[in-house]
Interface confidence: low
């Protein structure tokens, strides 16, 4: 197993309706043909995977589960799109990204993006 | 509906393993994560561990993560937690349930599962 580097943004914060977006940029050594990209979600000292997806270079992601994740992939790039957040939800999301497939095995683990979710405020009653 | 009734909970050495399953019915089983939590007497709900609707990704408590192993058959629509090296602090009612939304969240609050079953005894003996 060799170490990569990953970058991801420190803090994003989601959108109103609980979508929070950011990017995975994975520092290859080689050309890898299949990287799999898995999220982890770190909170209240334990950590637990949001979502994975393995693909083909140039192909889209398709995660597992009728998951709550969606993304595309460029070049060394992953563009993450988390959906359904709640205020409950926040926490550190950390991108973490294998690179399966020609050998070698390589495996890079990101600092975490933090994202706040803030649950929206009901609608006060309007008279038009 | 969906109705979770689990079993395999008794009583077991300190070190010793259990296997506790639960079996479901329900059409909509297989779509939707499940998870374990557990109560202990005189104390609240804990989340145990909870597993992905195709087995694929799972999420454990600190307390128990390296000696529990959460698991499911979908063919037999059941769901299991292989408990090993077990302590006397895992002594509780171990319920089985199913997060009332599809897809993979993990979460740890109860409130976010909405099928429960009964619960099966596991007292683990110093």
């Known amino acids: 197993c060799k170490a990569m580097h990953v970058a991801q943004p420190a803090v994003v914060l989601a959108s109103s309706r609980g979508i929070a977006s950011f990017v995975c940029e994975y520092a290859s050594p080689g050309k890898a043909t299949e990287v799999r990209v898995t999220v982890l979600r770190q909170a209240d000292s334990q950590v637990t995977e949001v979502c994975a997806a393995t693909y083909m270079m140039g192909n889209e992601l398709t995660f597992l589960d009728d998951s709550i994740c969606t993304g595309t992939s460029s070049g060394n790039q992953v563009n993450l799109t988390i959906q359904g957040l709640r205020a409950m939800d926040t926490g550190l999301y950390i991108c973490k990204v294998e690179l399966m497939y020609p050998p070698p095995y390589y495996l890079g683990i990101g600092n975490g993006t933090q994202i706040y979710v803030i649950d929206p405020e009901p609608c006060p009653d309007s008279d038009f | 509906e969906v109705q979770l009734v689990e079993s395999g909970g008794q009583l077991v050495q300190a070190g010793g393993s259990l296997r506790l399953s639960c079996a479901a019915t329900?059409?909509?089983?297989?779509?939707?994560?499940l998870g374990w939590f557990r109560q202990a007497p005189g104390k609240e709900h804990e989340f145990v561990a909870a597993?992905?609707?195709?087995?694929?990704?799972?999420a454990y408590a600190d307390s128990v993560k390296g000696r529990f192993t959460i698991s499911r058959d979908n063919a037999k629509n059941t769901v299991y937690l292989q408990m090993n090296n077990l302590k006397p602090e895992d002594t509780a009612v171990y319920y089985c349930?199913?997060?009332?939304?599809?897809?993979?969240?993990?979460?740890?609050?109860?409130?976010?599962?909405?099928?429960w079953g009964q619960g099966t005894q596991v007292t683990v003996s110093s």
């Open positions: 329900g059409r909509t089983y297989n779509s939707y994560s």
């Open positions: 597993i992905s609707a195709s087995g694929t990704l799972r």
């Open positions: 349930a199913r997060h009332h939304s599809v897809g993979w969240r993990a979460s740890h609050h109860l409130s976010d599962y909405d099928n």
